[in-house]
C-alpha cells in the first residue's frame, strides 16, 4: 500500500508534468505559427520591396536613356544654327579647336579630318594675331597645317597653296631633311620648323556656319 | 502487487510521454531560435532593400529634374542664333573665355563683368572635367570665381553660394590670411588657394544664348 501510494504520487507528478509540457508545446506551437506568419509577412515585404526596386531600376534606366537622347538631340539641334560646334572657338569666318592630346603631325591631321576640319591655316596677319593671342597662356607647341617634303620643296598648306613670305618667318630646323618631312608648329607666337614625326598639340580649323539664322 | 505493476506500467508510459514531450520542446526551441535568426536576417534584408529603394528614388528624382531641364532647354534652343560671342568657347549651357592678360583677382573679376560675365564657377565634376581639358596645354594659373575673406570664413562663389567639398580638394595656402583675401586658381587641373593680390590669367563664364529668336 505504501509502494502504491508512492507510485500514485509519482504518477500524479508525472501527469502534472506531462500536462504542463503539453501546455508548453501548445503555447510554442501557437508562437511558432505566429512566427511563421510573421516570417511570411517579412518575406512578402521583401518580395514587394525587391519588385519595387526592380521597377525603379527599370524606370531609372528608361529615364537615363531619355536623358541621353535629349542631350544628343540638344547637341544636334543647337549645332544647326550655331556658327561652331561645342568646345570650338568662333573667330571671324572660322571655328578653331585646340587639341587636348599630343600626336605627330600626320596623326594630328587625321584627328582634324575626323572632325570635318583641317589643321590650322593662317591667311592673314589678323589670323596670326588671333592665334598668337589664343595660345598666349600656353608654352606648348601646336602643329599647324604647313609642311614641306624637304628643303628643296616650298612650304605648302594642306590645301596645296603656298605660304606667303610676308606672314611670318620660320625659325628652327628650316634647312634640315627628315624622312617624314618638315612640319611647322606655332609656340609662344613664333613659328618653327621641326621633324613631322614628333608629338605636339595641334589646332584644327573649319569654316564657321554663318548661314542666315 | 497487480496494482503496483499497473501503476509502474502507467508510470513508464508517462515517463516515456514526458521524455517525448521534452524532446519535442527542445526541438521546437531550436526551431524557434533558428526562426528568430532567420527573422533577423529578413529584417536586415528589408532594411537594405528599403535603403536602396530610397537611394534609387533620389537618383530617379534627380534624373527626372535633369530631364525636365533638358526638355525646357530643347524648347528654347530651336532657331537660336550664336550661343556665344566670337572668341568664346561654347560648352553645354555656358560660354567660356580664357583671358589673354594677367591680372589680380579683383581686376580679373572686373574684366569679366565688363563682358557681361563672371569668373568661372564649377558646379559639377563634368564642368571640372571640361575646364581641366580646356587648360591641359597650359602650365599657367587661371583665377576662378571662388574666394574667402579669410580662413575663418567659408569658400564662396561670386554669386554667394558655398563651395561643395566633394567637387575638388584645394591645395596651396588654404589656411593663410591675406589682407586682400584668399582666392582660388586652377592650374594643371588642380585647384589652389592663393593671395588675391597676385596676377594670373582668368576664365570668364556666362550663360550661352539658347533662347528662341
Amino acid at each position: 500500500s505504501q509502494v502504491s501510494n508512492l507510485l500514485k504520487q509519482q504518477q500524479t507528478n508525472l501527469t502534472h508534468q506531462k500536462n504542463k509540457l503539453e501546455g508548453q508545446i501548445s503555447a510554442r506551437q501557437q508562437a511558432e505559427e505566429a512566427s511563421q506568419e510573421s516570417q511570411n509577412e517579412l518575406k512578402e515585404m521583401i518580395e514587394t520591396l525587391a519588385w519595387k526596386l526592380n521597377e525603379k531600376s527599370k524606370e531609372q534606366m528608361e529615364l537615363h536613356h531619355q536623358n541621353l537622347n535629349l542631350q544628343e538631340t540638344l547637341k544636334r539641334v543647337a549645332n544647326c544654327s550655331a556658327p561652331c560646334p561645342q568646345d570650338w572657338i568662333w573667330h571671324e569666318e572660322n571655328c578653331y579647336l585646340f587639341s587636348t592630346g599630343s600626336f605627330n603631325w600626320e596623326k594630328s591631321q587625321e584627328k582634324c579630318l575626323s572632325l570635318d576640319a583641317k589643321l590650322l591655316k593662317i591667311n592673314s596677319t589678323a589670323d596670326l594675331d588671333f592665334i598668337q593671342q589664343a595660345i598666349s597662356y600656353s608654352s606648348f607647341p601646336f602643329w599647324m597645317g604647313l609642311s614641306r617634303r624637304n628643303p628643296s620643296y616650298p612650304w605648302l598648306w594642306e590645301d596645296g597653296s603656298p605660304l606667303m613670305p610676308h606672314l611670318f618667318r620660320i625659325r628652327g630646323a628650316v634647312s634640315q631633311t627628315y624622312p617624314s618631312g618638315t612640319c611647322a608648329y606655332i609656340q609662344r607666337g613664333a613659328v618653327y620648323a621641326e621633324n613631322c614625326i614628333l608629338a605636339a598639340f595641334s589646332i584644327c580649323q573649319k569654316k564657321a556656319n554663318l548661314r542666315a539664322q | 502487487s497487480q496494482v503496483s505493476n499497473l501503476l509502474k506500467q502507467q508510470q513508464t508510459n508517462l515517463t516515456h510521454q514526458k521524455n517525448k514531450l521534452e524532446g519535442q520542446i527542445s526541438a521546437r526551441q531550436q526551431a524557434e531560435e533558428a526562426s528568430q535568426e532567420s527573422q533577423n536576417e529578413l529584417k536586415e534584408m528589408i532594411e537594405t532593400l528599403a535603403w536602396k529603394l530610397n537611394e534609387k528614388s533620389k537618383e530617379q528624382m534627380e534624373l527626372h529634374h535633369q530631364n525636365l531641364n533638358l526638355q525646357e532647354t530643347l524648347k528654347r534652343v530651336a532657331n537660336c542664333s550664336a550661343p556665344c560671342p566670337q572668341d568664346w568657347i561654347w560648352h553645354e549651357e555656358n560660354c567660356y573665355l580664357f583671358s589673354t592678360g594677367s591680372f589680380n583677382w579683383e581686376k580679373s573679376q572686373e574684366k569679366c563683368l565688363s563682358l557681361d560675365a563672371k569668373l568661372l564657377k564649377i558646379n559639377s565634376t563634368a564642368d571640372l572635367d571640361f575646364i581641366q581639358q580646356a587648360i591641359s596645354y597650359s602650365s599657367f594659373p587661371f583665377w576662378m570665381g571662388l574666394s574667402r575673406r579669410n580662413p575663418s570664413y567659408p569658400w564662396l562663389w561670386e554669386d554667394g553660394s558655398p563651395l561643395m567639398p566633394h567637387l575638388f580638394r584645394i591645395r596651396g595656402a588654404v589656411s593663410q590670411t591675406y589682407p586682400s583675401g584668399t582666392c582660388a586658381y586652377i592650374q594643371r587641373g588642380a585647384v589652389y588657394a592663393e593671395n588675391c593680390i597676385l596676377a594670373a590669367f582668368s576664365i570668364c563664364q556666362k550663360k550661352a544664348n539658347l533662347r528662341a529668336q
Epitope: - | P154, P165, R169, I170, G172, A173, S175, A190
Partner: antibody, heavy 115, light 107 residues
Framework: QVQLVQSGAEVKKPGASVKVSCKAS????????VHWVRQAPGQGLEWMGA????????AYVQKFQGRVTMTRDTSISTAYMELSRLRSDDTAVYYC????????WGQGTLVTVSS | DIQMTQSPSSVSASVGDRVTITCRAS??????LVWYQQKPGKAPKLLLY???RLESGVPSRFSGSGSGTDYTLTISSLQPEDIATYYC?????????FGQGTKLEIK
C-alpha cells in the same frame, strides 16, 4: 610614395622650447600645407596650425599664438614646429600632417615636459 | 570656433554588427567634415572626407552621411581590425576642430 618622417622624442624642462621637424617626400612639398596636431596622453586631437611651404606663411590657433612658430626649409622639404615657454600640460604627441583633409600623417613625436 | 560633439564616447559591439557614430557641429558646416581612425600608438588615418567620400584604399564597409550640422559614420559589418578611436573634424573654417573621439571596442 608620400611620407612624412618626424624627429625623435624629446624631454624638456618647464619654460624651455622644443623644435620638432617633419621631413616630407613623395610629393611636391610646396603645393600642400603642413598641419600640426597634438594629442595629450589619453586625450583627443587638437589642431595647432599650419604652414604653407610655398610662401612660408603660417596660421596658428589663438591658444598657441605667441608661443608657436612654424617654419620650413624647402631645400630639404622639411617643416618645423617650435613651441616655447613649455608647461607640463604641453606633454603630448605632436603630429605633422599634409593637406586638408589630412591625408598623410607623420609617425608622431612625443614631447615630455617635466621638472 | 565651431564645436564638434561626438556620440557615443565609447561603443562596444560584436564582429559583424552595424556600428553608427554621430558627430554634431555647433553650426552648419555644409559637408566639410572628415572622419579619422586612430589605433593605439599610431597616427590617425583618413577614412572619409566631404562627409561621405571614401578615401582610396579604405574598405567599403565604412560610409558617411549627413548634412548641415549632423553627420554619421557607419561601419556596416564590424571587423576585428576596426577596433580604434574615431574622430570627426570640420575643415570648413579655422580653427579646424575635432570631435572628442569615440572609442570602439569588441564585445
Amino acid at each position: 610614395q608620400v611620407q612624412l618622417v618626424q624627429s625623435g622624442a624629446e624631454v624638456k624642462k618647464p619654460g624651455a622650447s622644443v623644435k620638432v621637424s617633419c621631413k616630407a617626400s613623395g610629393y611636391t612639398f610646396t603645393d600642400y600645407e603642413v598641419h600640426w596636431v597634438r594629442q595629450a596622453p589619453g586625450q583627443g586631437l587638437e589642431w595647432m596650425g599650419a604652414i604653407h611651404p610655398g610662401s612660408g606663411g603660417a596660421a596658428y590657433v589663438q591658444k598657441f599664438q605667441g608661443r608657436v612658430t612654424m617654419t620650413r626649409d624647402t631645400s630639404i622639404s622639411t617643416a618645423y614646429m617650435e613651441l616655447s615657454r613649455l608647461r607640463s600640460d604641453d606633454t603630448a604627441v605632436y603630429y605633422c600632417a599634409r593637406w586638408l583633409p589630412m591625408d598623410y600623417w607623420g609617425q608622431g613625436t612625443l614631447v615630455t615636459v617635466s621638472s | 570656433d565651431i564645436q564638434m560633439t561626438q556620440s557615443p564616447s565609447s561603443v562596444s559591439a560584436s564582429v559583424g554588427d552595424r556600428v553608427t557614430i554621430t558627430c554634431r557641429a555647433s553650426q552648419g558646416i555644409n559637408n566639410w567634415l572628415v572622419w579619422y581612425q586612430q589605433k593605439p600608438g599610431k597616427a590617425p588615418k583618413l577614412l572619409l572626407y566631404a562627409a561621405s567620400r571614401l578615401e582610396s584604399g579604405v574598405p567599403s564597409r565604412f560610409s558617411g552621411s549627413g548634412s548641415g550640422t549632423d553627420y554619421t559614420l557607419t561601419i556596416s559589418s564590424l571587423q576585428p581590425e576596426d577596433i580604434a578611436t574615431y574622430y570627426c573634424q570640420q575643415y570648413l573654417i579655422t580653427p579646424y576642430t575635432f570631435g572628442q573621439g569615440t572609442k570602439l571596442e569588441i564585445k
